[in-house]
Interface confidence: medium
């Protein structure tokens, strides 16, 4: 048993039929010695009396909010949560495995630039009685500070018969230098509580590996005289690290016909303009990627040819 | 990215072209190592990230773009001093900081060159003959060092009398290649920045 936060405790339980469970001793936080009684959740049934209460925790029915009282007055609370371990493996029932980029990916994170700011998100099919708390640091043995906000519900999607909920959190490394060469990874730890079930999820990464620039901005077409060619121009996204001559991007320009089956023409360039042939009903798209470290491409920015 | 690329002219700055070749070569070598040594811990998640130049050079600090010198977090130490006569410097643009930066890059390359050559000598003794260093990568390091053209004492190649542990050598190769790729990215950024300045 360990303390998650004030008056909230996590009991680690071996989860199999007829498992012996864990013996837990609760102590009432009071100077009083006599006349103390204990109840669980909303029930008025007295579970025991005295300053301490010993319970055998085996299942979710044994978890919950234990309250000690004296003469009708509440003295203190202890909330017991369960962390299930099935044959040596912690349960991962609350979050959905996103399977991208590999199996067992419960948390996914992205950064728009090298400022030390990043966003992580996760998916669940659970809609109520759900809380998350997020902690992060750079390195684990001598951790350096990373500050995370509160996790919020960022999207809802319908997947077949199920509703899927996406939660996200923004974090910022306390003292980040965009030009630094990372040698210690960022660690992100998410505590998830659903009703009386506790689970924890972790992710470890270098900012350089989770970079995904915003799409190029101000995408414009300029027709070239007496030609089917157009000059496409764009700018670096506002959110990209500066100076741009140091944090350079490379771009992919694509001409795509109306039909997905039509052949795509692609050109790669380090410049912020390109000359392409604009077909009728086609559209021109541009996306960006760090020029020197091949992390993710941005989403496409597009304009119609007409 | 084996597709048509509209490449800019190398411009007036001769080292830019060499640094781009360097990044390409080290990235290819790292990819080859990860494929060949697939049953060794060779991915970014599996290795310990070590920097052999730590406390010996200060490339990130010395080559910091002017715009980032206002960022407190970027200014750890900028005290290292180096020789100042690089041929990549267009003479009118020569500044103390720029010379310091380029000489720091030169020292990095020299250290990695020694490590890679020592390692290659060990790998050539491996009866499995599983992996060797790409000669192109070693040549590209040499070319960039020549273009930087700093006078510096030559570092003797380390030799070891004991029987090499090939497993450890291959893991060290992965660690070295990962670190060198990160440094090659920094070098490329620096050259691009200096070229635009």
């Amino acid at each position: 048993i360990w303390e998650l936060k004030k008056d909230v405790y996590v009991v680690e339980l071996d989860w199999y039929p007829d498992a012996p469970g864990e013996m837990v001793v609760l102590t009432c936080d009071t100077p009083e010695e006599d006349g103390i009684t204990w109840t669980l959740d909303q029930s008025s049934e007295v579970l025991g009396s005295g300053k301490t209460l010993t319970i055998q925790v085996k299942e979710f029915g044994d978890a919950g909010q234990y309250t000690c009282h004296k003469g009708g007055e509440v003295l203190s609370h202890s909330l017991l949560l369960l962390h299930k371990k099935e044959d040596g493996i912690w349960s991962t029932d609350i979050l959905k495995d996103q399977k991208e980029p590999k199996n067992k990916t419960f948390l996914r994170c992205e950064a728009k630039n090298y400022s030390g700011r990043f966003t992580c998100w996760w998916l669940t099919t659970i809609s109520t009685d759900l809380t998350f708390s997020v902690k992060s640091s750079r390195g684990s043995s001598d951790p350096q500070g990373v500050t995370c906000g509160a996790a919020t519900l960022s999207a809802e999607r319908v997947r077949g018969d199920n509703k899927e909920y996406e939660y996200s959190v923004e974090c910022q490394e306390d003292s980040a230098c965009p030009a630094a060469e990372e040698s210690l990874p960022i660690e992100v730890m998410v505590d998830a509580v659903h009703k009386l079930k506790y689970e924890n999820y972790t992710s470890s990464f270098f900012i350089r590996d989770i970079i995904k620039p915003d799409p190029p901005k101000n995408l414009q077409l300029k027709p070239l005289k007496n030609s089917r060619q157009v000059e496409v121009s764009w700018e670096y996204p506002d959110t990209w690290s500066t100076p741009h001559s140091y944090f350079s991007l490379t771009f992919c320009v694509q001409v795509q016909g109306k039909s997905k089956r039509e052949k795509k023409d692609r050109v790669f360039t380090d410049k912020t303009s390109a000359t392409v042939i604009c077909r009728k009903n086609a559209s021109i798209s541009v996306r960006a990627q760090d020029r020197y470290y091949s992390s993710s491409w941005s989403e496409w920015a597009s304009v119609p040819c007409s | 990215r084996n597709l048509p690329v509209a490449t800019p002219d190398p411009g007036m700055f001769p080292c830019l072209h060499h640094s781009q070749n360097l990044l390409r070569a080290v990235s290819n070598m790292l990819q080859k190592a990860r494929q060949t040594l697939e049953f060794y811990p060779c991915t970014s998640e599996e290795i310990d990230h070590e920097d052999i130049t730590k406390d010996k050079t200060s490339t990130v600090e010395a080559c910091l773009p002017l715009e980032l010198t206002k960022n407190e977090s970027c200014l750890n130490s900028r005290e290292t001093s180096f020789i100042t006569n690089g041929s990549c410097l267009a003479s009118r643009k020569t500044s103390f900081m720029m010379a310091l930066c380029l000489s720091s890059i030169y020292e990095d390359l020299k250290m990695y060159q020694v490590e890679f050559k020592t390692m290659n000598a060990k790998l050539l003794m491996d009866p499995k003959r599983q992996i060797f260093l790409d000669q192109n990568m070693l040549a590209v390091i040499d070319e960039l060092m020549q273009a930087l053209n700093f006078n510096s004492e030559t570092v003797p190649q380390k030799s070891s009398l004991e029987e090499p542990d090939f497993y450890k050598t291959k893991i060290k190769l992965c660690i070295l290649l990962h670190a060198f790729r990160i440094r090659a990215v920094t070098i490329d950024r620096v050259m691009s920045y200096l070229n635009a300045s």
């Epitope: 680690e12 199999y16 039929p17 012996p20 040596g88 493996i89 349960s91 | -």
Partner: antibody
Framework: QELKESGGRLVTPGGSLTLSCTAS????????MTWVRQAPGKGLEWMGV??????LNYASWAQGRFTISKPSSTTVDLKMTSLTTEDTATYFC??????????WGPGTLVTVSS | DVVMTQTPSSTSAAVGGTVTIKCQAS??????LAWYQQKPGQPPKPLIV???ILTSGVPSRFKGSRSGTEYTLTISGVQREDAATYYC?????????FGGGTELEIL
């Protein structure tokens, strides 16, 4: 109440094989199922586990070449690909390796040889 | 992955003697440790789970204990039938690993 592994045989390097673990007189529904192997004259090696809800966890060396599945409430399979001579071993399945009532099968021998 | 370092790799004892086998976990695994006994040609048999809980039918001469990340199996009053190889199994909550094993010979 017993578990029995089957499917072990001689296979050539590079080949594939699927082992099955069948329960008789007991249910696998409320338990995790684990595969463990033991090379001749060597120690036990934990390979991976399939949880009650189907969650899969593998030893890092087993990731990719070995796949555990639960095709029914009484069987658990272990699919092995790209076999090498190093995979020659007795393969055991076990119900609940950390529980007091842990049950193991007698094992099935897989020999990889050309 | 958690690494379990088991010592010694082999040991011997006279009938009635005491044997101590240790397992060191490379990281904190709390009490998630089991001890197994294996005799030639047989599958392993669980002796102790959760570091110190004896499984049913196992004689009380077997005792498991824990100090930090070091786990100990003590056999007091060794019997002839205790000749076997003993393994620890530890789990960090994501994967498990066996120790290298300890072969016990009865003199």
């Amino acid at each position: 109440q017993e578990l029995k592994e089957s499917g072990g045989r001689l296979v050539t390097p590079g080949g594939s094989l699927t082992l099955s673990c069948t329960a008789s007189g007991l249910t696998l529904g409320s338990y995790s199922m684990t595969w463990v192997r033991q090379a001749p004259g060597k120690g036990l090696e934990w390979m991976g586990v399939i949880g009650v809800g189907g969650t899969l966890n593998y030893a890092s060396w087993a990731q990719g070449r070995f796949t555990i599945s639960k095709p029914s409430s009484t069987t658990v399979d272990l699919k092995m690909t790209s076999l090498t001579t190093e995979d020659t071993a007795t393969y055991f399945c076990a119900r609940g390796t950390y529980s007091g009532d842990s049950i193991w099968g007698p094992g099935t021998l897989v020999t990889v040889s050309s | 992955d958690v690494v379990m370092t088991q010592t010694p790799s082999s040991t011997s004892a006279a009938v009635g003697g005491t044997v101590t086998i240790k397992c060191q976990a490379s990281q904190s695994i709390s009490s998630w440790l089991a001890w197994y006994q294996q005799k030639p040609g047989q599958p392993p048999k669980p002796l102790i789970v959760r570091a110190s809980i004896l499984t049913s039918g196992v004689p009380s001469r077997f005792k498991g204990s824990r100090s930090g990340t070091e786990y100990t199996l003590t056999i007091s009053g060794v019997q002839r039938e205790d000749a076997a190889t003993y393994y620890c199994l530890g789990g960090d909550g994501h994967v498990s690993n066996f120790g290298g094993g300890t072969e016990l010979e009865i003199l």
